[in-house]
């Protein structure tokens, strides 16, 4: 299995955006890579977003995705937007080397993202 590293903890900003780097130790010379972000909460794992990209090119997530990202070498900088307190959880980075063979897959230990909803501004007279 391929080794995937990601930070243990990240705090989302006041606008509900969190960014973290997902780095993989590529044993092959992949030209096409797939990155998937999974969220684990209460032993349930759900897919947050996924993108396939060609080495040296931008990551392209679906138009309605809450994720954006950039790649550089064996690093992917992932940004998740629109997070709320209820979205606090463990976000796992899964990397697959899709082409050419051999196929490799690696899963990180996860990044615990903490999201704190901003306090509403008090009404001013």
């Amino acid at each position: 299995a391929m080794h995937v590293a990601q930070p243990a903890v990240v705090l989302a900003n006041s606008r509900g955006t969190a960014s973290f780097v997902c780095e993989y130790a590529s044993p092959g010379k992949a030209t096409e890579v797939r990155v998937t972000v999974l969220r684990q909460a209460d032993s349930q794992v759900t897919e947050v977003c996924a993108a396939t990209y060609m080495m040296g090119n931008e990551l392209t997530f679906l138009d309605d995705s809450i994720c954006t990202g950039t790649s550089s070498g064996n690093q992917v900088n992932l940004t998740i937007q629109g997070l709320r307190a209820m979205d606090t959880g463990l976000y796992i980075c899964k990397v697959e080397l899709m082409y050419p063979p051999p196929y490799y897959m690696g899963i990180g230990n996860g990044t615990q993202i903490y999201v704190i909803d901003p306090e509403p501004c008090p009404d001013s007279d």
């Epitope: 096409e32 797939r34 396939t52 060609m54 051999p102 196929y103």
Partner: antibody
């Protein structure tokens, strides 16, 4: 159900052209590399061409380089093989094949094949 | 001439153990690429039998096993049955050809 369905085979004269199609269903087509593999009558399997999930990377066997073109339309979940300057030795059953398990790169899904006959 | 070399035929009686070899080179099996084995019954499309040298897809009986060493690999079938009569192909990615290469195939005959 995961499925591949080839079409477009038939009888063609030497020097002629054919376009094969492979319709995929039951898996995330755009994520996975696809290949064409052929089998001449009474002979073994021969890999013809492969294309990455995005279509950005393509490889051909030397025997078809410059004559065959592989392509894919991810919006239609379809793989194509444009075959030009066909020769008698291209006569074969053509299979499209892929791996969609996310466990390995072996071809665990095959179509039923489409027969291409090159003869005058 | 296939890039991977297999014996053209093999045979055995029911219950016996049969081994099929697959020899490659430093640009495919010897380069560390995994070997996959396919079974093709008469008149049907190939079916994945063994992947990543020695792993079985679900539904494949444990009578089938694979191994790899250096530039060669082998498929072993124990407790041979009449329904095992088929063509068997090994395959691996080839670094220098930038493509998949297959063995020429081995026709397995179950005698008696």
């Amino acid at each position: 159900e995961v499925q591949l369905l080839e079409s477009g085979g038939g009888l063609v004269q030497p020097g002629g052209s054919l376009r094969l199609s492979c319709a995929a269903s039951g898996f995330t087509f755009s994520s996975y590399a696809m290949s064409w593999v052929r089998q001449a009558p009474g002979k073994g399997l021969e890999w013809v061409s492969g294309i990455s999930g995005s279509g950005g990377y393509i490889h051909y066997a030397d025997s078809v380089k410059g004559r065959f073109t592989i392509s894919r339309d991810n919006s239609k979940n379809t793989l194509y093989l444009q075959m030009n300057s066909l020769r008698a030795e291209d006569t074969a059953v053509y299979y499209c094949a892929t791996y969609s398990s996310g466990l390995h790169d072996a071809f665990d899904i095959w179509g039923q094949g489409t027969l291409v006959t090159v003869s005058s | 001439q296939s890039v991977l070399t297999q014996p053209p035929s093999a045979s055995g009686t029911p219950g016996q153990r049969v081994t099929i070899s697959c020899t490659g080179s430093s640009s495919n099996i010897g380069a560390g690429y995994d070997v996959h084995w396919y079974q093709q019954l008469p008149g049907t499309a190939p079916k994945l039998l063994i992947y990543d040298n020695n792993k079985r897809p679900s539904g494949v009986p444990d009578r089938f096993s694979g191994s790899k060493s250096g530039t060669s690999a082998s498929l072993a079938i124990s407790g041979l049955r009449s329904e095992d009569e088929a063509d068997y192909y090994c395959a691996a990615w080839d670094d220098s050809l930038n493509g998949w290469v297959f063995g020429g195939g081995t026709k397995l005959t179950v005698l008696g």
